[in-house]
C-alpha cells in the first residue's frame, strides 16, 4: 500500500493543500485513496511512513511576521484532528520572494478510514512547479 | 533491496552529483547498483522509496539570483529523463557562505533497468563533509 | 519494527536531544526501545530507515558564527560513535529568532544492540511544540 500525489494550485482559500493523481504519481491499489483532492485515506489499520514536501516562495516584508509552517495532520474516524508533524521556515529577504523547501516524514499508526492531509499557513506561497511539492505514504 | 551512498567531490563540471560506496554506505545486494558513480540502477520492477539529502554552502552576492535547486531525476530505459522531486533554497547572506540542507523523498514505481540520480544547480557549493550529502532508496 | 518518538525539553546541557513516548508516538514492540530518553536501541540486526526532524529557532547575532547542525549518530556495541547523517542551516536574521526545520533520513545496517541518537549544536534553540521535532526508525 503506497501513494505519492502531486500538488495542485487551488482557487480555494483553505489552508489545506490540494493534490492530484497526475505526473509521476503513485496509487498502488484501492486500499489508499485520494479523497476530495485533499486527503489520503487508508482502508487498513497499520503502521505507515507518511511524508510531505512543500516548496514555497515568500518575502519577509510581504508576509506576516509568523514563519511559514507546514503541518501534516491526521483525521481518524470518531476522533479530533491532530497534528502529526510540523516544520517551520522564516521568510526570506530575497525579492520578489525567496524559495525554500520543507520536508516532513514519520511513522504513525493509522486506523481504518483514517485520513492524512497537509496544512500550510499561506497556500498562495506554495510552489507547484514539477516535483516541488508532493505528499505520500507507504504501509510498513 | 536498499542502497545508501555517500557524496563525493568531483572535478567534473556536470550538474549531476557523484556518489561512492564509502563510509557507512549500504548496498544490500546486486539488485541495486551504483553506476558510473552517479546513478542508482535497479534490476527489479516495483515501488521504491527514493531519497536524497544535499547540504550546500552559498552566498547571495556570489551566486546567481536563482535559488539553489536539487532535483531527483529518473531515467527509464527507452524514456526521456524526468524530474521526480525538486527542492529549492534561496542563497544565504552569510559570509563567506551560509550552509543549508535539503531533503527529498518519495515513493515511485521503477521499471527494470531504471536509474535515479541527483542534479544540482551548482555542484561546487555542495558540502561533502561526513554525513552532509547522501542518496539512497529502498524497495517496498 | 518501528518507532517514532517526540522531543522533550531538557535541563541537561548535553548536545544529545531528549525524547519521550508521548503524544502520537509509535513503539511497535520490544525489539526497539527508547533508552534513557535519548537513544533508540534495536535488538535485531538488519537494514533500517532512520530519520529525524529538528525545528529550531535562532538569530544570527545571538548565535555563534557556526551554523546550527543536527547530526544522526550511531553507537554500536564495541565500536566508536559515528555520524550517519548531518544537516546544517545558517542562523536567521529574524528577531528575536527565526524558525527553521531540518530533516534527516537514510538506510543503514544496524547490529543487535546498536543505538542511534540525535546531536545538535545548541539544544536550547530546539522547538518542542507539537510535531516540530521528532525521531524514528523502521526496519526494512
Amino acid at each position: 500500500i503506497a501513494a505519492h500525489v502531486i500538488s495542485e494550485a487551488s482557487s480555494k482559500t483553505t489552508s489545506v493543500l490540494q493534490w492530484a493523481e497526475k505526473g509521476y504519481y503513485t496509487m498502488s491499489n484501492n486500499l489508499v485513496t485520494l479523497e476530495n483532492g485533499k486527503q489520503l485515506t487508508v482502508k487498513r489499520q497499520g503502521l505507515y511512513y507518511i511524508y510531505a514536501q512543500v516548496t514555497f516562495c515568500s518575502n519577509r516584508e510581504a508576509s506576516s511576521q509568523a514563519p511559514f509552517i507546514a503541518s501534516l495532520c491526521l483525521k481518524s474516524p470518531g476522533r479530533f484532528e491532530r497534528i502529526l508533524l510540523r516544520a517551520a521556515n522564516t521568510h526570506s529577504s530575497a525579492k520578489p520572494c525567496g524559495q525554500q523547501s520543507i520536508h516532513l516524514g514519520g511513522v504513525f499508526e493509522l486506523q481504518p478510514g483514517a485520513s492524512v492531509f497537509v496544512n500550510v499557513t499561506d497556500p498562495s506561497q506554495v510552489s507547484h512547479g514539477t516535483g516541488f511539492t508532493s505528499f505520500g505514504l507507504l504501509k510498513l | 533491496i536498499a542502497a545508501h551512498v555517500i557524496s563525493e567531490a568531483s572535478s567534473k563540471t556536470t550538474s549531476v552529483l557523484q556518489w561512492a560506496e564509502k563510509g557507512y554506505y549500504t548496498m544490500s545486494n546486486n539488485l541495486v547498483t551504483l553506476e558510473n558513480g552517479k546513478q542508482l540502477t535497479v534490476k527489479r520492477q516495483g515501488l521504491y522509496y527514493i531519497y536524497a539529502q544535499v547540504t550546500f554552502c552559498s552566498n547571495r552576492e556570489a551566486s546567481s539570483q536563482a535559488p539553489f535547486i536539487a532535483s531527483l531525476c529518473l531515467k527509464s530505459p527507452g524514456r526521456f529523463e524526468r524530474i521526480l522531486l525538486r527542492a529549492a533554497n534561496t542563497h544565504s547572506s552569510a559570509k563567506p557562505c551560509g550552509q543549508q540542507s535539503i531533503h527529498l523523498g518519495g515513493v515511485f514505481e521503477l521499471q527494470p533497468g531504471a536509474s535515479v540520480f541527483v542534479n544540482v544547480t551548482d555542484p561546487s557549493q555542495v558540502s561533502h563533509g561526513t554525513g552532509f550529502t547522501s542518496f539512497g532508496l529502498l524497495k517496498l | 519494527i518501528a518507532a517514532h518518538v517526540i522531543s522533550e525539553a531538557s535541563s541537561k546541557t548535553t548536545s544529545v536531544l531528549q525524547w519521550a513516548e508521548k503524544g502520537y508516538y509509535t513503539m511497535s514492540n520490544n525489539l526497539v526501545t527508547l533508552e534513557n530518553g535519548k537513544q533508540l536501541t534495536v535488538k535485531r540486526q538488519g537494514l533500517y530507515y532512520i530519520y529525524a526532524q529538528v525545528t529550531f529557532c535562532s538569530n544570527r547575532e545571538a548565535s555563534s558564527q557556526a551554523p546550527f547542525i543536527a547530526s544522526l549518530c550511531l553507537k554500536s556495541p564495541g565500536r566508536f560513535e559515528r555520524i550517519l547523517l548531518r544537516a546544517a542551516n545558517t542562523h536567521s536574521s529574524a528577531k528575536p529568532c527565526g524558525q527553521q526545520s531540518i530533516h534527516l533520513g537514510g538506510v543503514f545496517e544496524l547490529q543487535p544492540g546498536a543505538s542511534v541518537f540525535v546531536n545538535v549544536t545548541d539544544p536550547s534553540q530546539v522547538s518542542h511544540g507539537t510535531g516540530f521535532t521528532s525521531f524514528g526508525l523502521l526496519k526494512l
Epitope: K75, G78, E81, R82, P112, G113 | - | G23
Partner: antibody, heavy 120, light 111 residues
Framework: DVQLQESGPGLVKPSQSLSLTCTVT?????????WNWIRQFPGNKLEWMGY???????SYNPSLKSRISLTRDTSKNQFFLQLNAVTTEDTATYYC?????????????WGAGTTVTVSS | DIVLTQSPASLTVSLGQRATISCKAS??????????LHWYQQKPGQPPKLLIY???YLESGIPARFSGSGSGTDFTLNIHPVEEEDAATYYC?????????FGGGTKLEIK
C-alpha cells in the same frame, strides 16, 4: 439546512425483517459524515445500532451484528436499515442521525423518529 | 461496553437556580487529552438534541447557560440559571469506544 426523515412500516411481525429508510435533504450523504441508526425503547433507553459512512463503510453494534445491515442509495440520498428476525424486544422508536466522521461520534442532526411495533 | 450511569434519575429545580446532572463512566472515556463524552436534551415527542460535545464544547445555537465539565470517568452537566423551557430528559453519551453508549437519562422538572 440538512434534514433527516425516517419512513417504514409501523408494525412488523415477529421473526420477520424490519426495513426503514432515512431520506436526507440539504446535504449529500457521500460528501462527509457518518449516517447512523439509533433506537429508543419504551422505557426511554437509547441504543446506537450502527452507521454507514460517506464512503460506504459500515460499523454495527456487536449486540446486533448478526441481524443488522445498513445500505444506501446515493442517487436518492437515502440510507437504509434492515433488522432481521425481529422480536417484541425490537419495539422502539427508530431515529436516523448524523455524526461527524472525523471528530467525536456525537449526533448533531436527528430525524423526528418513527415508531415500530413488533407484534403478531 | 462502557456503561454510563447518570444521577440523579430525576430532579426538580426552582426557576433561576442551578441544575447539576452527573454522568459516571465504567472506564475512562478520555483519549489523547480529549474527553469523548456528549450531552443531549430530549423533550417528549421529539428526538434528542445535542447540547455539549467532548465534555465541555457548547454546540452552536445552544444557550450559554448550559455548560459541561469533567474528564476520565466523571462528568457534569450544569444548567444555570434554569429556565422553564429546560424541562426535559438529559442523556450523556460516550464515543471513546465502540459501541457508542448512552446513559439512562435524568428527568429535570422546573418548579
Amino acid at each position: 439546512d440538512v434534514q433527516l426523515q425516517e419512513s417504514g412500516p409501523g408494525l412488523v411481525k415477529p421473526s420477520q425483517s424490519l426495513s426503514l429508510t432515512c431520506t436526507v435533504t440539504g446535504y449529500s450523504i457521500t460528501s462527509d459524515y457518518a449516517w447512523n441508526w439509533i433506537r429508543q425503547f419504551p422505557g426511554n433507553k437509547l441504543e446506537w445500532m450502527g452507521y454507514i459512512t460517506y464512503s460506504g463503510t459500515t460499523s454495527y453494534n456487536p449486540s446486533l451484528k448478526s441481524r443488522i445491515s445498513l445500505t444506501r442509495d446515493t442517487s436518492k440520498n437515502q440510507f437504509f436499515l434492515q433488522l432481521n428476525a425481529v422480536t417484541t424486544e425490537d419495539t422502539a422508536t427508530y431515529y436516523c442521525a448524523r455524526s461527524p466522521y472525523y471528530g467525536p461520534w456525537y449526533f448533531d442532526v436527528w430525524g423526528a423518529g418513527t415508531t415500530v411495533t413488533v407484534s403478531s | 461496553d462502557i456503561v454510563l450511569t447518570q444521577s440523579p434519575a430525576s430532579l426538580t429545580v426552582s426557576l433561576g437556580q442551578r441544575a447539576t446532572i452527573s454522568c459516571k463512566a465504567s472506564q475512562s472515556v478520555d483519549y489523547d487529552g480529549d474527553s469523548y463524552l456528549h450531552w443531549y436534551q430530549q423533550k417528549p415527542g421529539q428526538p434528542p438534541k445535542l447540547l455539549i460535545y467532548a465534555a465541555s464544547y457548547l454546540e452552536s445555537g445552544i444557550p450559554a447557560r448550559f455548560s459541561g465539565s469533567g474528564s476520565g470517568t466523571d462528568f457534569t452537566l450544569n444548567i444555570h440559571p434554569v429556565e422553564e423551557e429546560d424541562a426535559a430528559t438529559y442523556y450523556c453519551q460516550q464515543s471513546n469506544e465502540d459501541p457508542n453508549t448512552f446513559g439512562g437519562g435524568t428527568k429535570l422538572e422546573i418548579k
